[in-house]
Amino acid sequence: MMTGTIETTGNISAEKGGSIILQCHLSSTTAQVTQVNWEQQDQLLAICNADLGWHISPSFKDRVAPGPGLGLTLQSLTVNDTGEYFCIYHTYPDGTYTGRIFLEVLESSVAEHGARFQIP
């Protein structure tokens, strides 16, 4: 039975040209995390495999940095980065857990962050 839950940054906003940390956290399970996939609507951003390390898709290589931890730092944000992001946790023996983050990239100089994870 899958007992785990994923906590995410929820809905977050950031300034155009700035950076944001996409972060998820799997709790309430003793399952082993074997891999985390980060995806946007219809494309892969990155994969972090516990054994094999990071894969970053070529579309994002110039502006995605691995981490912190299993998270992902998205840099040089543009308005086109607005949208849904998914963290997909591959675990053993539970299977997969999926978390959702909505990012809004703002033109203005004021951008409020979600409450669960504070981005400095």
């Epitope: 996939n37 995806e39 054994d51 970053i56």
Partner: antibody, heavy 119, light 107 residues
């Protein structure tokens, strides 16, 4: 330029083990994973697993779990794949491959090592 | 494990033809797909990855597309040197798996 040079052909009896080496040059060895792919005669490609040379971590295809060992010797930039309890259906060409920068795709390949298992 | 079903398994085409090979994943693999070319007695070569990026030195007649479960590999104008077997591969989740291959012949 990046090169992966594998050890020579082997003939083994069923139940024996084989150890194939893959000598890397032209890049910083610990910065890229080494993967192993095999191809039985007239058949397709099968991923066996990979090793992260920076820490020795391995990830295996469960089809080979318990029979395969992947190791590295960073001092000589060489990766090894050992397959034990050989069977006739392990007869294949074994390739070592290297990923792209921050990429899992197989960008560089060794020349292949033919392993024949026959009594 | 994720199965990659490639079709057709073989095809015959003429020089200059447009050739299309498809690969269907048994479950979602996002854009974590690559295509390889293998000539007899040789190691495979990476052609396309992620799944529309041409690898260094690969001619522009080779292209790829797709997302999710359905992927396409295209040779826009077949050349004699393109005679080979082509494989798709997913690296979305381990164990990474290949399609069964498409053997391409000249008519």
């Amino acid at each position: 330029q990046v090169q992966l040079v594998q050890s020579g052909a082997e003939v083994k009896k069923p139940g024996a083990s084989v150890k194939v080496s893959c000598k890397a040059s032209g890049y910083t060895f610990i910065s890229y994973n080494i993967y192993w792919v095999r191809q039985a005669p007239g058949q397709g490609l099968e991923w066996m697993g990979g090793v992260n040379p920076s820490n020795g971590n391995t990830n295996f295809n469960e089809n080979f779990q318990g029979r395969v060992t992947m190791t590295v010797d960073t001092s000589i930039s060489t990766a090894y794949m050992e397959l034990s309890r050989l069977r006739s259906d392990d007869t294949a060409v074994y390739y070592c491959t290297r990923g792209n920068y921050y990429g899992y795709e197989f960008a560089y390949w060794g020349q292949g090592t033919t392993v024949t298992v026959s009594s | 494990d994720i199965q990659m079903t490639q079709s057709p398994s073989s095809l015959s085409a003429s020089v200059g033809d447009r050739v299309t090979i498809t690969c269907k994943a048994s479950q979602h693999v996002s854009t974590a797909v690559a295509w390889y070319q293998q000539k007899p007695g040789k190691a495979p070569k990476l052609l396309i990855y992620s799944p529309s990026y041409r690898y260094t030195g690969v001619p522009s007649r080779f292209s790829g597309s797709g997302s999710g479960t359905d992927f396409t590999f295209t040779i826009s104008s077949l050349q004699p040197e393109d005679i080979a077997t082509y494989y798709c591969q997913q690296h979305y989740s381990t164990p990474w798996t290949f399609g069964g291959g498409t053997k391409l012949e000249i008519k």
